[in-house]
């Protein structure tokens, strides 16, 4: 079905990290253009990326309106220069995306260690609470604002002089760990949403080590 000179989009794929979300598809168009529509299960279709020759569409603005909703997108194909043309069934060719629930599926971005501070044999490690593009009352919410206690961080730490790693977990953005006096430690963190079935963990943060500029050391 559809017009003889258009092909339906295929391989519709959601690409999403910390709610920044684009839909990608194939093929690269030849003599055709695309328009994307997005909807919640109960909502109306909203058109985006009108008559584009791209094979991607940024849908962030739509999904951040309610990240717990489930969204469906569809990609319409039109002949270039004749966007009124429809298929044999009276509408243009289109293909549906997989369903996408941002809260459950967006990838967790690589976290950043904001700072660490040693006081005696205790070290306080703070993870940066990254801003997202989700808004409330015209301000951007942080990852913690959005996920609350669903989000935990795992800290990996080890003596600079050895390879044996220890771990700690927190459902805030701070760790307080015990260290050996006089030893330098290195740290890396990972964001985790334990309740998820997919995309549960972020990649590890860049490693930060004591004795470098991020930290503060106070001998008590």
């Amino acid at each position: 079905s559809g017009t003889t000179n258009t092909v339906a989009a295929y391989n519709l794929t959601w690409k999403s990290t910390n709610f920044k979300t684009i839909l990608e598809w194939e093929p690269k168009p030849v003599n055709q253009v695309y328009t994307v529509q997005i909807s919640t299960k109960s909502g109306d279709w909203k058109s985006k990326c009108f008559y584009t020759t791209d094979t991607e569409c940024d849908l962030t603005d739509e999904i951040v309106k309610d990240v717990k909703q489930t969204y469906l997108a569809r990609v319409f194909s039109y002949p270039a220069g004749n966007v009124e043309s429809t298929g044999s069934a009276g509408e243009p060719l289109y293909e549906n995306s997989p369903e996408f629930t941002p809260y459950l599926e967006t990838n967790l971005g690589q976290p950043t260690i904001q700072s660490f501070e040693q006081v005696g044999t205790k070290v306080n490690v703070t993870v940066e609470d990254e801003r997202t593009l989700v808004r409330r009352n015209n301000t951007f919410l942080s990852l913690r604002d959005v996920f609350g206690k669903d989000l935990i961080y795992t800290l990996y730490y080890w003596k600079s002089s050895s390879s044996g790693k220890k771990t700690a977990k927190t459902n805030t953005n701070e760790f307080l760990i015990d260290v050996d006096k006089g030893e330098n430690y290195c740290f890396s963190v990972q964001a985790v949403i334990p309740s998820r079935t997919v995309n549960r963990k972020s990649t590890d943060s860049p490693v930060e080590c004591m004795g470098q500029e991020k930290g503060e050391f106070r001998e008590i």
Partner: antibody, heavy 118, light 107 residues
Framework: QVQLVQSGAEVKKPGSSVKVSCKAP????????ISWVRQAPGQGLEWMGR????????NYAQKFQGRVTITADKSTSTAYMELSSLRSEDTAVYYC???????????WGQGTLVTVSS | AIQLTQSPSSLSASVGDRVTITCRAS??????LAWYQQKPGKAPKLLIY???ILESGVPSRFSGSGSGTDFTLTISSLQPEDFATYYC?????????FGGGTKVEIK
């Protein structure tokens, strides 16, 4: 007001490479698309490519494909544009620009003059 | 790639004149068009996006219109600070493309 601060002017030999940086404020740097646009002396504006830092998605104008690489470092909120196999016609001011809610450019860097000369 | 043809390439006008610049796209780009002003030695400055929406802080003497393939930038009463080069840009599809520019000079 978002300020994009670019690295300083460069003079390069034909055949060499140049890497220009563009530092953005922290915050939502990762989420906004950063494009690179160049302008040869007395000429118009030419889009080279772009990157969405948090997704790692980059694409390039066909003219520059294989010669340009755009990267971003989230930890320093800095985007980079590297252009290789330089020739005299690459002499231009190179701008980084932040794409707004769509793909128009709401904030621009101050520009970096790259001169290619033997 | 979508081509944008701007006309005229240059024009001479006096303070207080009404100035119109046109931009024609090689294919339908809906309203995905922006206008920029550039002064010598400076980066371009966004004036209008979505064909007709004035960027915050831009004087109301600037206006944009059009949809599909034909677009217009109008300066209702030219001011001394408006002498510059103006570019249109389509953001319907990658690669993003610009018009060739229109230089507005003092008569």
């Amino acid at each position: 007001q978002v300020q994009l601060v670019q690295s300083g002017a460069e003079v390069k030999k034909p055949g060499s490479s140049v890497k220009v940086s563009c530092k953005a404020p922290r915050g939502t740097f990762s989420y906004y698309t950063i494009s690179w646009v160049r302008q040869a002396p007395g000429q118009g504006l030419e889009w080279m490519g772009r990157i969405i830092p948090i997704l790692g998605v980059a694409n390039y104008a066909q003219k520059f494909q294989g010669r340009v690489t755009i990267t971003a470092d989230k930890s320093t909120s800095t985007a980079y544009m590297e252009l290789s196999s330089l020739r005299s016609e690459d002499t231009a001011v190179y701008y980084c620009a932040r794409e707004g809610d769509r793909r128009y450019f709401d904030y621009w860097g101050q520009g970096t003059l790259v001169t290619v000369s033997s | 790639a979508i081509q944008l043809t701007q006309s005229p390439s240059s024009l001479s006008a006096s303070v207080g004149d009404r100035v119109t610049i046109t931009c024609r796209a090689s294919q339908d780009i809906s309203s995905a068009l922006a206008w920029y002003q550039q002064k010598p030695g400076k980066a371009p400055k966004l004036l209008i996006y979505d064909a007709s929406i004035l960027e915050s802080g831009v004087p109301s003497r600037f206006s944009g219109s059009g949809s599909g393939t034909d677009f217009t930038l109008t300066i209702s009463s030219l001011q001394p600070e408006d002498f510059a080069t103006y570019y249109c840009q389509q953001f319907n599809s990658y690669p993003l493309t610009f018009g060739g520019g229109t230089k507005v000079e003092i008569k």
